[in-house]
Interface confidence: medium
């Protein structure tokens, strides 16, 4: 086509020179200057932004580093030049959050949109009498869904930042040391008491190691949504149920529904936000599996969803089974990747934390050496991984998981059957040809699924250049909910895997990630990396990035692209 656009019945004011013409000559630019058409300097026409658009709504967002808009309406803005805007206001009465599209050439609430070109919505305070008023604008799809009040790295001078860190670090060392000692002593005491109360799966390790490793596990505790750690990993056997008020339905799975809920604090008005997974009476087995997995205190890890308690509830709908866990406002990884393009740092963080979570699940010991029952997830996929506020992953949905108890016989393992989601099933699972003599083979199927998730993350990383809309693995090959047979055709017959375009490999960090995930989806389960090895590779990437002092450069990694890790 190219200049051929000028042919036909095109009205003069939408005549466009495309990329073949490289840039639009000034006289043509004037002729296309109506407000429905916006072009970049290469002559491409901008599609209007996708923005959250709920106008003004009451909000609970207060005193947080960032908030989700909780707006369920995504609109294509009317005009291509419009950007996404969020306005947060607080007065004596209430807090509101406004989400709209707006033209940055025009003031909004009497303020100019100074940050319209930013891909993130970073709130800036504006002076308004009688209220606290914050506003942000941004220009990437649905960027006003996640509003940020404090950007972690907001200094433009990294050297200055380093100096600040060094000075404050040195001056804070003595009081920090004292504080950490006090915390460790307190935790050891608390955990010691908890240890006496709970009967955990133990082997003959010394008490000393148990005490040391327990405080170690607690130091690793995640940045929980806002849950007091005191009630973590308990089963609520009491007849008195927790004071929970269900809020909104946030997810629906095969076996259960997940609600955002308020956990009331004593008699005060205060509450903590939690997630409640509600299983109907018929899905008791699934609830019990997940409850039993969560009950193991050694499962506790920053990259595994934090569990509070399990309850049996009688309602007018009959008996229900509840699991109460931490709530993560960013939602699951699939939703997050659908809404957001991620940076190289985000990819490294998400990938690394995912691998660490799976490695911990698979491990037969805690990070501090305490014995632990290895577990396989068996349904790893992007919708079963939650994104925490610090942009790390945590695993959830253990309804199909299996504890690799050394007492299980081959028959027991064989009876566990072909489980999981067809799209993410490893070739040997699709074929029902697993080596049941070796429990490691179960872990290898998790690693295959993890590789597909790492590919999903990479496909949405802007370090690769072209970022397409989110697609699940094999998105263009199979329908939305593929059956085992169609996956067999793709994965077994055609030996198909998601495509890794050559331009992804221009970024050396991404190249390493691609090499890693390719080794993880190998047809031969024995040839796949372990989750621990993948975690180590991500650590090495982080180390290499830190050495280079730059975050996005393609020169960060040694030319030979070597990473010294073993399987």
């Amino acid at each position: 086509m190219g200049r051929g656009l000028l042919r036909g019945l095109w009205p003069l004011h939408i005549v466009l020179w495309t990329r073949i013409a490289s840039t639009i000559p000034p006289h043509v630019q004037k002729s296309v200057n109506n407000d429905m058409i916006v072009t970049d300097n290469n002559g491409a026409v901008k599609f209007p932004q996708l923005c959250k658009f709920c106008d003004v709504r009451f909000s609970t967002c207060d005193n947080q580093k960032s908030c989700m808009s909780n707006c369920s309406i995504t609109s294509i803005c009317e005009k291509p030049q419009e950007v996404c805007v969020a306005v947060w206001r607080k007065n004596d009465e209430n807090i509101t959050l406004e989400t709209v599209c707006h033209d940055p050439k025009l003031p909004y609430h009497d303020f100019i949109l100074e940050d319209a070109a930013s891909p993130k919505c970073i709130m800036k305070e504006k002076k308004k009498p009688g209220e606290t008023f914050f506003m942000c604008s941004c220009s990437s799809d649905e960027c006003n869904d996640n509003i940020i009040f404090s950007e972690e790295y907001n200094t433009s001078n990294p050297d200055l930042l380093l100096v600040i860190f060094q000075v404050t670090g040195i001056s804070l060392l003595p009081p920090l040391g004292v504080a950490i000692s006090v915390i460790i002593i307190f935790y050891c005491y608390r955990v010691n008491r908890q240890q006496k109360l709970s009967s955990t799966w133990e082997t003959g390790k010394t008490r000393k190691l148990m005490e040391f490793s327990e405080h170690c596990a607690i130091i690793l505790e995640d940045d929980r949504s806002d849950i007091s750690s005191t009630c973590a990993n308990n089963i609520n056997h009491n007849t008195e149920l927790l004071p929970i008020e269900l809020d909104t339905l946030v997810g629906k799975g095969r076996f259960a529904e997940v609600y955002k809920a308020k956990l009331k604090q004593n008699t005060s008005e205060q509450f903590e936000t939690v997630a409640v997974k509600i299983f109907p009476y018929e899905e008791y087995a699934s609830w019990k599996t997940e409850k039993d997995i969560f009950s193991d205190i050694n499962l506790k890890h920053e990259n595994i969803l934090q569990f509070l308690t399990a309850e049996e509830r009688k309602t007018e709908l009959g008996k229900q089974y509840w699991l109460i866990t931490a709530f993560h406002a960013k939602g699951n990884l699939q939703e997050y990747l659908t809404r957001h393009v991620i940076s190289w740092e985000d990819l490294r963080k998400l990938g690394s934390s995912l691998a660490r979570g799976i490695a911990h699940l698979h491990s037969d010991h805690t990070p501090c050496g305490r014995p632990k029952m290895p577990i396989v997830h068996r349904d790893l996929k992007s919708s079963n991984i939650l994104v925490k506020n610090d942009l790390t992953c945590c695993l959830c949905d253990f309804g199909l998981s299996l504890r690799l108890d050394p007492t299980l016989s081959v028959d027991d393992l064989a009876n566990s059957g072909q489980v999981g989601t067809a799209r993410y099933m490893a070739p040997e699972v699709l074929e029902s040809r697993m080596n049941l003599e070796n429990v490691e083979s179960f872990k290898q199927t998790d690693v295959y699924s993890m590789a597909l998730v790492l590919w999903e993350m990479t496909s949405r990383c802007n370090a690769v250049g072209e970022v397409k809309d989110y697609e699940p693995p094999f998105g263009s090959k199979v329908r939305e909910h593929p059956c085992v047979e169609s996956m067999k055709d793709n994965v077994l017959r055609d030996r198909g895997r998601p495509e890794i375009p050559s331009f992804w490999l221009n970024h050396q960090g991404i190249q390493m990630v691609c090499e890693t995930l390719t080794e993880c989806w190998d047809h031969d389960p024995e040839a796949r990396l372990t989750a621990q090895c993948v975690a180590e590779r991500f650590s090495e990437l982080e180390h290499l990035d830190r050495l280079s002092g730059r975050s996005c450069s393609e020169e960060k990694i040694p030319e030979d692209g070597s990473l010294n890790t073993t399987k």
Epitope: R19, N42, A44, Q49, S139, S140, N462, K468, D469, E471
Partner: nanobody, 121 residues
Framework: EVQLLESGGGLVQPGGSLRLSCAAS????????MAWARQAPGKGLEWVSR????????YYADSVKGRFTISRDNSKNTLYLQMNSLRAEDTAVYYC??????????????WGQGTLVTVSS
């Protein structure tokens, strides 16, 4: 050479249906997001809908939500727009467009010549 050729337009009564097609050639169709836009007589260009490269994600303008459905057949290199419950205000020239890439923003660099849809009793 990139080519986009729309077809399927015509005269239809209010409440009626039409299916527009856009045949693409000159590029790897399955690699690119596609979109439909329209221009009513004497008005500016209005975006109608957008679809991801494999058809997994779709987006619609509020004015057509629930009535129009965008789809694609990558094996036939064809983009579709199924238009139901048509109204007089849907009268316009409908264009199909191919997305280019800049990492974050959605920009469309190639356009068809358009097909005219007239909704009138």
């Amino acid at each position: 050479e990139v080519q986009l050729l729309e077809s399927g337009g015509g005269l239809v009564q209010p409440g009626g249906s039409l299916r527009l097609s856009c045949a693409a050639s000159g590029f790897t169709f399955s690699d690119y997001d596609m979109a439909w836009a329209r221009q009513a007589p004497g008005k500016g260009l209005e975006w109608v809908s957008r679809i991801s490269h494999s058809g997994y994600s779709t987006y619609y303008a509020d004015s057509v939500k629930g009535r129009f459905t965008i789809s694609r057949d990558n094996s036939k290199n064809t983009l579709y727009l199924q238009m139901n419950s048509l109204r007089a205000e849907d009268t316009a020239v409908y264009y199909c467009a191919k997305r280019s890439w800049d990492g974050v923003h959605a920009q469309f660099d190639y356009w068809g010549q358009g097909t005219l849809v007239t909704v009138s009793s």
